[in-house]
């Protein structure tokens, strides 16, 4: 079964701690129709003349997932738990299309970084997505921030179009992803 949430409009500002900018280059708040033009929902359901979405309010739909760009600062672990409380997980990037979509979203926040669902226990152990799946560097490279002072950056965030490792305790924003099945 799938919950159908009515799409709401927001502004390109913070609302309840969430970044509501959509997928337009000038980052102006699109109408629902312009949102459809830029990020086509795969299967939006119309009910009583109102376009409904399989995503909750304030979440952005792209292909088969809903995304929430949280603008509350948290450690990686705190961000993971915040996503869990919303019935989702930290972002897992599955394709180059999805990566492009995410880069487009976060590029409008050039001063901010966003945790994604990739971590490892220590440098000798491979990166692991939050769901336990393997990480393949074919999709993207992780640029290291390791220094002698901070030798163990074991969590991953995205900043504009670059993905970096980072100390897991550093407070940052985050991206939650909720996959839906039709």
């Amino acid at each position: 079964t799938m919950a159908i949430w009515r799409s709401n409009s927001g502004s390109n500002t913070l609302e309840n701690g969430y970044f509501l900018s959509r997928n337009k280059e000038n980052h102006s708040q699109p109408t629902q129709s312009s949102l459809e033009d830029s990020v086509t929902p795969t299967k939006a359901v119309k009910t009583t003349g109102v376009l409904s979405s399989p995503c909750p309010p304030n979440w952005i739909i792209y292909e088969k997932s809903c995304y929430l760009f949280s603008m509350s600062l948290n450690s990686w672990d705190g961000s993971k738990r915040q996503c869990w409380q919303l019935g989702s997980n930290l972002l897992k990037i599955d394709s180059s299309n999805e990566l492009g979509f995410i880069v487009k979203q976060v590029s409008s926040q050039p001063d901010n970084s966003f945790w994604i669902g990739l971590s490892r226990p220590q440098t000798e152990v491979p990166w692991l997505w939050e769901d336990g799946s393997t990480f393949s560097s074919n999709l993207f490279q992780i640029r290291t921030t390791a220094t002698q002072e901070n030798p163990s950056p074991n969590c991953v965030w995205i900043h504009v179009s670059v993905i970096y490792d980072q100390l897991c305790s550093v407070p940052s924003y985050s991206i939650c992803e909720k996959k839906f099945s039709m």
């Epitope: 152990v125 692991l128 336990g132 799946s133």
Partner: antibody
Framework: QVQLVQSGAEVKKPGASVKVSCKSS????????IHWVRQAPGQGLEWMGW????????NYAQKFQGRITMTRDTSISTAYLELSRLRSDDTAVFYC???????????WGCGTLVTVSS | DIQMTQSPSSVSASVGDRVTITCRAS??????LAWYQQKPGKCPKLLIF???SLQSGVPSRFSGSGSGTDFTLTVSSLQPEDFATYYC?????????FGPGTKVDIE
């Protein structure tokens, strides 16, 4: 649903080799590490190593180095464990398990009993 | 290798009891710890991962806590199906290692 189905029990002589299979279904085989864990009769659990089914990369526990080989056949979503130069103290149930969050083992095969006896 | 120790090695308890099992790592493992339940002749079942995250489908009477070297598995109200052996496992460094197990049996 996720399922791991293992091959049947084996009886081997000391010095021989054994190859155990683990067929996966219900998920994308190449997306998750497969671990092998053994349990001697009445004993605890012992991690032997893993294979990344996508790349074929392996990581073996040091104590098994030189006589353990993990392989996979992605066309039939099956992982294999081969243990050579068997000794009587290798008698154990061998489990395959699929990786889950935080490198835990979320799904297990039902085990393959390997008996090493002369 | 990281050594994992568990205490007690066995515990006798009754239905409805609160049972606590502890696991200690020989060095810090952050939160990279899992708990499993195993019944005789059966394969292990994941209960807790990441030290405190409940695996999907596991009853909420199971909970995990701890970080670093000291961890706890708690069963808030023991049920008949909970009599089993419980293992902790570290996933911080290779080789991954298990504790020796704690057997929970009927008092």
């Amino acid at each position: 649903q996720v399922q791991l189905v293992q091959s049947g029990a084996e009886v081997k002589k000391p010095g021989a080799s054994v190859k155990v299979s683990c067929k996966s279904s219900g998920y994308t085989f190449t997306d998750y590490y497969i671990h092998w864990v053994r349990q001697a009769p009445g004993q605890g659990l012992e991690w032997m190593g893993w294979i990344n089914p996508n790349s074929g990369d392996t990581n073996y526990a040091q104590k098994f180095q030189g006589r353990i080989t993990m392989t996979r056949d992605t066309s039939i979503s099956t992982a294999y464990l081969e243990l050579s130069r068997l000794r009587s103290d290798d008698t154990a149930v061998f489990y395959c398990a699929r990786n889950s969050g935080s490198y835990s083992f979320g799904y297990w095969g039902c085990g393959t009993l390997v008996t090493v006896s002369s | 290798d990281i050594q994992m120790t568990q205490s007690p090695s066995s515990v006798s308890a009754s239905v409805g009891d609160r049972v606590t099992i502890t696991c200690r790592a020989s060095q810090g493992i952050s939160s990279w710890l899992a708990w499993y339940q195993q019944k005789p002749g059966k394969c292990p079942k994941l209960l807790i991962f990441g030290a405190s995250s409940l695996q999907s489908g596991v009853p909420s009477r199971f909970s995990g806590s701890g970080s670093g070297t000291d961890f706890t598995l708690t069963v808030s109200s023991l049920q008949p199906e909970d009599f089993a052996t419980y293992y902790c496992q570290q996933a911080y460094s290779f080789p991954f290692t298990f504790g020796p197990g704690t057997k929970v049996d009927i008092e």
